[in-house]
């Protein structure tokens, strides 16, 4: 007996479409080896029509496909348009040649059944309105109309002219006339529901004068799509469910069975094992809408349907869409921290992989939001400007060719903490999730940047210091000016550097930036850092402002600016860095569900390039001492 | 609730033919697929026959290894109905024939794991 294990008969009609499923031992080499469809001949020579090396056979093109779950150890042959010839022997199976492992299947494609000569056929999906057309003489004009559904022998009675509705159709059937009609009332059924399916007949008139029409009507199941996405991707549902619903709530919910539980609805309701990694987006005013779901795990697959209704909730008998999500283990998405914890006051470095091939794509960092939908406003982005609120602590760092870049974010309160996305505006699947949680600090950050006050008077020279631990000896410490397009390095001095790592004295490894001669476009944010190679660490933020030296006010209270750094309160008082209110137009790109938005918050930020920069470190003269 | 129940067991000569019958009932059966297990005295469960149809006209039969084109599983023209004809019958068919259904999307229709509904079972027993 073969190990491999499929339906032995598939019958259907002409037209239609048949999904076979095979199912193989759950092994390395079975997971990996070709899989094949093949029909089997007079001669015993198995032909093959499709297999998973590629191959797809001249009357299967444009028609036929064939899918492996390795992770079910079973593969589908989707075969569509079905036509009489098609019926035949077939084998599905597993190996090099067509003798391997395999299972037989018979296949029969009939003619499309014949129902009574009148009978007009109704296919409509779970959820909609049908419309019966029942015509009748000009003799039955005056007589009761009716429609009765066929149960065996008996036709029970659905619906007449002296407003009978049978209980199970109440609020669904209606029968009517339109305009000056006089041979022709229809039924309208709505809310669909499977066992609707059937045989009617409708008929005006009694006895033998009346006239009858039969209707069969077919009520399908909605055919789920096939999605296959790998481990730590994304996923988008998109789904369009008619205007007929479009005032209505809109939901989407994974079966567990029998029930179908809500991932997300636009009331607001939420699963927290998405927390964070979701987004519902209306698309027009048609009811369209998607839902993206960012950094896909192995339990996240399963079958899903995205449904409308007043409750937000799924109810028998309202359209649906739906779709079986694959998640494939074997990803070519890095793993990568999904949690990074900060303390207040101090900073995180997070590193965002993006398809190494798209180096050139650009890169967002934004921070999801749980309104109703989920949102998530774009922070920063490489040609995108920082969001306000943002300046001087935060700062993208792209590292082409390595498949990554990193964003910094510094004087951290405990309002940063929640859940942000990487993202680029190329390959959708390359969005990463990222839950940041900051603590209350309880020591001293390792940074420390003298003199704290800093204000630096024009003409003259000025020196910041940064203090770090003996544990940062090894690594690169840098100095970097902060504007709108990142953090630009300056040349700096590091004293710590002369002295033997093993003598390290705690109290002198200082890294120290000079300016000289100080200018009026050397007020702003300045950043101390530590980094190895591509991999940034701790930074700390001080705010230097630049004052005349005859008058005494600086343009910023720097004790203020520099208070945020050091005890991070919740109010934002910065006026540094104002820009025109034009550019405040690209900070909220919406809802990021997909790259055409993407695309357009790039297009937007690089409209806004010329007028949004705040001045960069081209103006910047370090001098070592 | 859902409730399936078996009919058509009994004693039968070996060569003989038997048709056993499932009735599902209840408003929530919506299942679109139906599956016999038999089970011996003293043996584990074992898969007999499955039924999973779309609203399309079409259908896949799925079979046991031993039915070797004995056993017929069909669905009746009363969608809630599911048939198993066997012919042929064997001394070694003899056991407690139980038809099943699921809440709703089935894995390997082989495994009992894959069903929700279960009937009481009827008795086929097959002299020499």
């Known amino acids: 007996q073969s190990p491999i294990f499929g339906p032995q008969d598939v019958s259907s009609i002409e037209g239609n479409s048949v999904s076979i499923t095979c199912y193989y031992p759950d092994t390395s080499v079975n997971r990996h080896t070709r899989k094949y469809w093949c029909r089997q001949g007079a001669n015993g020579y198995c032909a093959t029509l499709i297999s998973s090396n590629g191959y797809l056979s001249k009357e299967y093109s444009g028609r036929a496909s064939l899918i492996n779950f390795p992770e079910n150890s079973t593969f589908v042959i989707n075969i569509a348009h079905l036509t009489q010839e098609d019926t035949g022997s077939y084998k599905c199976g597993l190996g090099t040649t067509n003798r391997g492992l395999f299972f037989d299947v018979s296949l029969e494609v009939s003619q499309v059944p014949e129902f009574p000569n009148d009978t007009h056929v109704y296919t409509k999906d779970i959820g909609r309105t049908v419309t019966i057309e029942c015509r009748f003489k000009e003799g039955n004009a005056h007589s009761k109309k009716s429609l009765c559904k066929k149960r065996g022998e008996a036709c029970e009675v659905v619906i007449d002219s002296t407003e009978y509705v049978d209980p199970s159709y109440k609020d669904r059937a209606i029968l009517f006339m339109k305009g000056t009609s006089r041979d022709i009332f229809y039924v309208n059924i709505s809310h669909l529901i499977p066992s609707d399916a059937g045989l009617y007949v409708c008929q005006a008139g009694e006895g033998p004068s009346a006239d009858k029409n039969n209707a069969d009507l077919q009520v399908l199941e909605p055919e789920p799509e096939l999605l296959y996405k790998d481990l730590r991707s994304s996923v988008t549902f998109e789904c369009d469910l008619g205007r007929e619903v479009a005032n209505d709530a809109k939901y989407l919910c994974r079966k567990n069975k029998e029930t179908c539980d809500v991932i997300i609805n636009t009331l607001g309701k939420r699963d927290p094992a998405f927390e964070g990694r979701i987004l519902l987006t209306p698309r027009d005013d048609n009811g369209r809408f998607s839902v993206l779901i960012t950094g896909l795990r192995k339990e996240d697959a399963g079958h899903y349907q995205c449904g409308a209704h007043s409750s937000g909730l799924p109810q028998e008998g309202w359209p649906v869409q739906a779709w079986q999500l694959f998640v494939n283990e074997e990803s070519t998405i890095p793993n990568s921290r999904s949690v990074v914890k900060g303390v207040t006051g101090g900073s995180v470095a997070i590193v965002c992989p993006y398809n190494p091939k798209e180096s050139s794509s650009l890169k967002y960092w934004c921070h999801w939001e749980a309104d109703e939908n989920g949102r998530c406003p774009v922070l920063v982005g490489t040609q995108a400007l920082v969001q306000e609120g943002y300046e001087g602590r935060l700062a993208l760092f792209d590292q082409p060719g390595s498949g990554a870049y990193t964003v910094i974010l510094n004087q951290l309160t405990t309002q940063d903490s929640g859940f942000y996305w990487c993202l680029t505006d190329g390959d959708s699947r390359w969005r990463t999730t990222i839950e940041l949680q900051v603590a209350e600090a309880t020591k001293k950050p390792d940074l420390e940047v003298t003199p704290q006050n800093a204000t630096a008077v024009i003409g003259e020279t000025f020196t910041i210091s940064c203090h770090y631990p003996c544990k940062f000896y090894s690594q690169e410490k840098y100095w970097c000016k902060w504007s709108n397009d990142g953090c630009h390095i300056l040349p700096s001095h590091d004293e710590g550097a002369r002295q033997s790592s093993v003598s390290c004295d705690q109290s002198s490894q200082i890294v120290s930036m000079t300016l000289n001669p100080v200018k009026k476009e050397d007020e702003g944010w300045y950043w101390c850092g530590v980094k190895e190679g591509q991999v940034y660490g701790e930074t700390t933020a001080i705010y230097v402002a630049v004052e005349e030296r005859t008058r005494g006010s600086p343009h910023i209270n720097p004790t203020d600016a520099n208070a945020r750094a050091k005890d991070a309160p919740e109010e934002e008082a910065m006026e540094s860095s104002v820009r025109e209110d034009e550019n405040k137009a690209n900070l909220d790109p919406r809802l990021f569900a997909d790259e055409r938005e993407i695309q357009n918050a790039g297009d937007q930020a690089q409209e806004n390039r010329a007028s949004g920069n705040a001045g960069s470190a081209g103006g910047q003269s370090g001098s070592s001492k | 609730e859902v409730q399936l129940v078996e009919s058509g067991g009994g004693l039968v000569q070996a060569g003989g033919s038997l048709r056993l019958s499932c009735a599902a009932s209840?408003?929530?059966?919506?299942?679109?697929?139906v599956g016999w297990f038999r089970q011996a005295p003293g043996k584990e469960r074992e898969f007999v026959a499955h039924?999973?149809?779309?609203?399309?006209?079409?259908?896949?039969?799925y079979y046991g290894d031993f039915v070797k084109g004995r056993f017929t599983i069909s669905r009746g023209t009363a969608k809630n109905t599911v048939y198993l004809q066997m012919n042929s019958l064997k001394p070694e068919d003899t056991a407690v024939y139980y038809c099943a259904a699921p809440k709703g999307a089935i894995g390997d229709p082989r495994s009992t794991r894959e069903y929700d509904y279960w009937g009481q079972g009827t008795l086929v027993t097959v002299s020499s």
């Open positions: 039924i999973h149809w779309s609203g399309d006209f079409t259908t896949y039969y």
């Open positions: 209840g408003r929530t059966f919506s299942s679109d697929a």
